[in-house]
Interface confidence: medium
Amino acid sequence: RVSDGLQASPPATLKVVAIRPAIQIHRSTGLRLAQGSAMPILPANLSVETNAVGQDVSVLFRVTGALQFGELQKQGAGGVEGAEWWATQAFHQRDVEQGRVRYLSTDPQHHAYDTVENLALEVQVGQEILSNLSFPVTIQRATVWMLRLEPLHTQNTQQETLTTAHLEATLEEAGPSPPTFHYEVVQAPRKGNLQLQGTRLSDGQGFTQDDIQAGRVTYGATARASEAVEDTFRFRVTAPPYFSPLYTFPIHIGGDPDAPVLTNVLLVVPEGGEGVLSADHLFVKSLNSASYLYEVMERPRHGRLAWRGTQDKTTMVTSFTNEDLLRGRLVYQHDDSETTEDDIPFVATRQGESSGDMAWEEVRGVFRVAIQPVNDHAPVQTISRIFHVARGGRRLLTTDDVAFSDADSGFADAQLVLTRKDLLFGSIVAVDEPTRPIYRFTQEDLRKRRVLFVHSGADRGWIQLQVSDGQHQATALLEVQASEPYLRVANGSSLVVPQGGQGTIDTAVLHLDTNLDIRSGDEVHYHVTAGPRWGQLVRAGQPATAFSQQDLLDGAVLYSHNGSLSPRDTMAFSVEAGPVHTDATLQVTIALE
């Protein structure tokens, strides 16, 4: 019942009917990848459809059988560039849409043929489960393999050289002259450094078989360990176009009973808050001593270390002891900035009983602080322009027309949810199902060109959009203007070309404006109707009199001047997209030498 404070309406009933979910496989095309490599599983490879029209339902995929030749992985930390990939047995369709699911070929075996991994999956929506879905992954066999892969044995922090006794690659179809083998470090060692001529190798970097032959590749453990530990690095070898499987190189590091043992555990602090840095988070001790002094090498960037309970906001703690950590005297205070992490590099030095004691031992490390974000910002509109559409026609609605941002850290703008009301002058529908109106969609849907506006009724109107980041709301209006279909090329298009030289004609030179539903650059065609007089139009290296919008986007169209002394040239074009056409001219200014 609705009331304005004085009067109330008669009761109305909202009927909610829960229907059983229906699941249908939309795509399960499988993957094809090289042995030893990884490939994302995208909606083009794997997607399902449900009868939950206009609802944001959770579609869960589960792996039901063991994998033989690799692993399924999911990317952590919201798909941030460089975030770690972890083995997983389950993932959501949303993860697939965000490119956060991949198959990694880990099988190091030498095969005569390509192998096929059939991922057995089941799909769950609500209580409904669709079983026996097979997703085939074809793994192109490797032809480079390891003739020798022998573990490295090293003692603590001393540098050991990797030789051909440890690593030697061979090619299945070796020719008369041996190829150059390139080793790519896929995952660097965690407990030490792999170095090429003294420079640390990280993920994606590498070395050659010649480097191994010449003794240029070394490994050294980063810290002395009190017990024997194992380290590994993962690598693959190429001799283009040939490649190897993904290999793991084992490293055995001998123990040292009197080595310092470091406890270094992430401290989690709320945005703008503080947390006690205790011995549970940071502590160094050895067999014969628990007396260590810590020096802060670099102040934290987004907060400060302070003594617990102090009111002085200006002083910073730059050194402390194990005693301070044991008694919980130290706090990290965050500065309330929109940051997700901070770090504190330190050196811990063993304190001798007398000044004549043995050389002090050092442990270097970085103490990390994770900042828990607080959603304290509302979304803000960053793009707003009139949305032009052909009368009675349709057009993609994208982030070129309306877009928002959110200042909260750890929040991807793609996650913003837009909700719209019913329209009197058209409807908003899904691109892949134009009969289905959609009322909720994400900014990612706009960016990925999944949203279509279909015009009907009045020529002018406003779409009221409610934008939410899950906590805060913002309202925005998108003005829609319908008119006869048009194509326009910006007036005064011009290009400057050196005498006898070339200039690229791209979309910045011929800027097209239209209200048509153009999905691809191949739908717009340009034909030269006059000129040029002092040069010629070149497309993909050949003289041309016609080209497409795609050619402009690709930078494939050039004006090539013939070297004459005329200071300007002109070209006229007819521009067509379906039944609509217009004329355009391009002025070319020649920069005479």
């Epitope: 030498h110 095969h111 005569a112 043929y113 390509d114 096929v116 085939p136 074809t138 393999w145 061979t170 090619l171 299945e172 179809e173 070796a174 020719g175 008369p176």
Partner: antibody
Amino acid sequence: EVQLVESGAEVKKPGDSLKISCKGSGYSFTSYWIGWVRQMPGKGLEWMGIIYPGDSETTYSPAFQGDVTISVDKSISTAYLQWNSLKASDTGIYYCARRRGNYYMDVWGNGTLVTVSS
Amino acid sequence: QSALTQPASVSGSPGQSITISCTGTSSDVGGYNYVSWYQQHPGKAPKLMIYDVSNRPSGVSNRFSGSKSGNTASLTISGLQAEDEADYYCSSYTSSSTRYVFGTGTQLTVLG
């Protein structure tokens, strides 16, 4: 010159054992897969299996798995095809061939005719 | 895994062009660009004529060409000559456990 030379024709009785050979020369024998192909009288080519001389990795076609053994002696650049108990239906020409890149055979042996008859 | 399907015989006059088809499935011909063609004269070993659908080894006449559409591969011989009379076999990699499959074979006759 790259070539594969196979051993001579054989006439055997059902139940006999047999080992035929294929010697490679003119190239790095251990670096290329060697496959075996059967051609029964008046019939087409049938894929039997393959071996990599570098490490003796072997793969058989399911139709021949268990009936034949493919092996290699890389010290003399020779591949072998062996039967423990021949049948009359094993009669045919057996070719060895060098496999290149993406599953094609660029060099073929001259073929060994095996006749099994009581 | 059954063999790839080829016509049993094809014929043509000298100078003409002929095409031999080789039909498989999406697990072999359609799924991979690993189709090869072999020529076999009576009493001789097969000879590689085309590999990876359309590539010609050195020494093979450019009258021989290969192509593929969907699940069917084709070998075309233009300017037919008497010495082209032979049996022709296609083959393909397959994702089935057989791994490698030959065609049923086509007998080419050069008339006259």
